[in-house]
Interface confidence: low
């Protein structure tokens, strides 16, 4: 097995100290909120302009409309992350021109073309997660190490739509090491 | 090079209306995510937020002296007003006006004017 | 409305000491914090924002850390141009500063 430090899961991304998961199946908001909790992260809390910028180019890149972290479901209106806190005032020039429009109860934010747009929360969307990246200061299961053959199994009655986050965590590593440098 | 400037007169008497201005250049309040803000700071005091405009207009005040405050710009002259009503001797501070930088996330405020020290008494 | 409590209120020190002030805030503020350097008869002058960021043109001798209630100033060797009153301001929910700190020569 090589000790080779690597900061994030198999398929994930990296940037400025965090690990992002771009799903390749869909789910609606909630279950996308379940999908991130089951692999240990959120779905993305966006913290600063580099990061909105970061993802906005993943999604916009690959035509997707795309769930992050973020709803008005507690109080019409009020925007609020995933973790608690508020969409502070200046991240609203991020929206759409016209957006948020709450049209039909959309109380749900995804990235849509160059920025941000509320849809139906029960609409299947493919969806970020966000967790910190490992520092490689012990061994975790980030080192580039062999995987274990079968993962295990999302928890009884979870759904599908996990397959993706799963799967990628099966590669070998010699794989992933060809493939990431 | 940006600048902020605030004007308004040096001394006020209690239960008038203070109108302090903030005069600026460098920037827009036109520019998307761009905002003015003022602040101020009584005499050996610590810092107090008093209310914040975005470009877009939206207001926002602080909870303690909102029904005293009223802020509005002009685009046009890079000018933002700061009006309070009811003055009091307790309202004798320094006045300054910043700015939150456009594309910031964070509402920080990293450029300030010099400040114009108001003194309520009759 | 969010509280901020900064300590010590003053901090006597030498040129050349490490000095660590802390900023503490009545709620989760996240890493929405910014730290503003202010000397006698002058405007606050931004340091640090986002808890860690430096502002461009800052000595790095200063930085921040900290998340949720808890943060951190330090001036890892104190200059005679450092001493000053350093606020701590939240954003996370409008706006608040706390009650400043006071860098005095010992």
């Known amino acids: 097995t090589e000790r080779l430090c690597h900061p994030c899961p198999w398929e994930w991304t990296f940037f400025q100290g965090n690990c992002y998961f771009m799903s390749n199946s869909q789910r609606n908001w909630h279950d996308s909120i379940t999908a991130c909790k089951e692999v240990g992260a959120q779905l993305v809390v966006i913290k600063s302009a580099e990061e909105q910028n970061f993802l906005q180019l993943q999604s916009s890149r690959s035509n997707r409309f795309t769930w992050m972290g973020l709803s008005d479901l507690n109080q019409e209106g009020t925007w609020q992350w995933v973790d608690g806190s508020p969409l502070l005032p200046s991240f609203k020039q991020y929206w759409n021109r016209g957006e948020p429009n709450n049209v039909g109860e959309e109380d749900c934010a995804e990235f849509s073309g160059n920025g941000w747009n509320d849809d139906k929360c029960n609409l299947a969307k493919f969806w970020i997660c966000k967790k910190s990246a490992a520092s490689c200061s012990r061994d975790e299961e980030q080192f580039l190490s062999p995987a274990p053959a079968t993962p295990n199994p999302p928890p009884a009655g979870s759904g599908g739509g996990l397959n993706d986050i799963f799967e990628a965590q099966k590669i070998e590593w010699h794989e992933h090491h060809h493939h990431h440098h | 090079q940006v600048t902020l400037r605030e004007s308004g007169p040096a001394l006020v008497k209690p239960t008038q209306t203070l109108t302090l201005t903030c005069t600026f250049s460098?920037?827009?309040?036109?520019?998307?995510?761009?905002?003015v803000t003022w602040i101020r700071q009584p005499p050996g005091k610590a810092l107090e937020w008093l209310a914040l405009?975005?470009?877009?207009?939206?207001?926002y005040y602080s909870t303690s002296l909102k029904t005293r405050l009223a802020i509005s710009k002009d685009t046009s002259k890079n000018q933002v007003v700061l009006t309070m009503t009811n003055m009091d001797p307790v309202d004798t501070a320094t006045y300054y006006c910043?700015?939150?930088?456009?594309?910031?996330?964070?509402?920080?405020?990293?450029?300030w004017g010099r400040g114009t020290l108001v003194t309520v008494s009759s | 409305d969010i509280q901020m409590t900064q300590s010590p209120s003053t901090l006597s020190a030498s040129v050349g000491d490490r000095v660590t002030i802390t900023c503490r805030a009545s709620?989760?503020?996240?890493?929405?914090l910014a730290w503003y350097q202010q000397k006698p008869g002058k405007a606050p002058k931004l340091l640090i924002y986002?808890?860690?960021s430096l502002e461009s043109g800052v000595p790095s001798r200063f930085s921040g850390s900290g998340s949720g209630t808890e943060f951190t100033l330090t001036i890892s060797s104190l200059q005679p141009d450092d001493f000053a009153t350093y606020y701590c301001?939240?954003?996370?929910?409008?706006?608040?500063f706390g009650q400043g700190t006071k860098v005095e020569i010992k």
């Open positions: 709620q989760s503020i996240s890493t929405w």
């Open positions: 405009i975005d470009w877009d207009d939206d207001k």
């Open positions: 986002e808890a860690s």
């Open positions: 301001q939240q954003y996370n929910s409008y706006w608040t």
């Open positions: 910043a700015r939150t930088p456009s594309g910031s996330y964070g509402r920080y405020f990293d450029l």
């Open positions: 460098g920037f827009s309040l036109s520019t998307s995510g761009v905002s």
